[in-house]
């Protein structure tokens, strides 16, 4: 994974800190895996990156993703709040200048090369879930989460809060 382009060095220099005019609260370099401990990997194919969900061989190195955290007002129209609550949003970048994007029309998760400011499709509300898991909700499409479908990442509509704990939208973040 990313073997073609070589191992990326993650420094602040690679990810400047003004996205949509807001600086990240903090950044975190982590590997991303599913609830069932399959790894999320990224591979360069035909000059574009593909995202896979796969079991790694025993000593195979996990790909890393840079999570940039942002503080955001909770839009009252998303929850019926009418209150300025706060939530945490993230962008996810596995290599310089590439970010995970929600393609709501295709219900897919894609890696796009883009310039800053990043589009809203690159932002995800981070949910702190049970069992040391997180989930990623599309900023552009509330109720739609990054999930696993057929060994790929896809966008999955969660129709009720009872389904928020569905295993296929739960992910683990690890520094190793």
């Amino acid at each position: 994974a990313f073997g073609i382009s070589g191992v990326q060095k993650y420094t602040r220099a690679l990810h400047d800190s003004s996205i949509t005019g807001i600086s990240p609260i903090t950044e975190y370099l982590a590997s991303l895996s599913t609830y069932n401990d399959q790894s999320i990997t990224f591979a360069l194919e035909d000059e574009s990156y593909e995202i896979y969900v796969e079991d790694l061989k025993k000593d195979e190195k996990k790909d890393k993703v840079l999570l940039s955290y942002y503080e955001s007002q909770h839009p009252s129209n998303e929850s019926g709040d009418g209150v300025d609550g706060k939530m945490l949003m993230v962008t996810l970048s596995p290599t310089k200048d590439f970010w995970l994007h929600a393609n709501n029309k295709e219900h897919s998760v894609e890696l796009h090369k883009c310039e800053k400011p990043l589009p809203d499709q690159a932002f995800f509300v981070l949910h702190n879930m049970h069992s040391n898991c997180v989930s990623f909700e599309c900023k552009t499409d509330p109720g739609v989460f990054i999930g696993v479908k057929d060994n790929h990442l896809a966008l999955i509509k969660v129709d009720s809060s009872e389904n928020l704990c569905t295993e296929n939208i739960l992910f683990k973040l690890s520094e190793t």
Partner: antibody, heavy 119, light 111 residues
Framework: EVQLVESGGGLVQPGGSLRLSCAAS????????MSWVRQAPGKGLEWVAT????????DYVDAVKGRFTISRDNSKNTLYLQMNSLRAEDTAVYYC????????????WGQGTLVTVSS | EIVLTQSPATLSLSPGERATLSCRAS??????????LNWFQQKPGQPPRLLIF???NRGSGVPARFSGSGSGTDFTLTISSLEPEDFAVYFC?????????FGQGTKVEIK
Amino acid sequence: EVQLVESGGGLVQPGGSLRLSCAASGFTFSSFSMSWVRQAPGKGLEWVATISGGKTFTDYVDAVKGRFTISRDNSKNTLYLQMNSLRAEDTAVYYCTRANYGNWFFEVWGQGTLVTVSS
Amino acid sequence: EIVLTQSPATLSLSPGERATLSCRASESVAKYGLSLLNWFQQKPGQPPRLLIFAASNRGSGVPARFSGSGSGTDFTLTISSLEPEDFAVYFCQQSKEVPFTFGQGTKVEIK
């Protein structure tokens, strides 16, 4: 306006039971994790229990495990705390709290309801 | 469980002065690269109010004179210039893991 209003507190004898309610309004109740936090008179704050928005997960502080049950009725926008086998040390103001969207911290608090356990 | 120790227990200051409150955790409260340490203000007869979340981020409607800092196990709440309404009890709280725990509180009183 977001509001949490607790009720059900009162005086109860040791070993007795009480059910607290928290009526929520002004937000989509089922989208948020809810908790109970208590404060003994003149003392600090103690987290008691949490329930996820979809009722799937519950967690309790050790001191109340097996005696207290947190539940919610999303159709009624109401959070509950069933308290059994009450002890003197359970005497406190009980606050209903709502997590922020995403469940990272206690963002909204009710005014609290006083539970007194005494013979 | 994670034990939070606040100091000092009481801080006696005058309006306009700077207040510095400390909270030390028995182990790191970092998770997913975030410091999951929050600060609350409580006035007599009132519920707590969120001031700071994730160590350094102000809650909604919290004045800019309140700021939080720190990481790992050591955290600070600073009130740059005390207003009369700031005299209250302040609690830190960790949301890294269950049981969620609070510090014992620091009372900021008028000197």
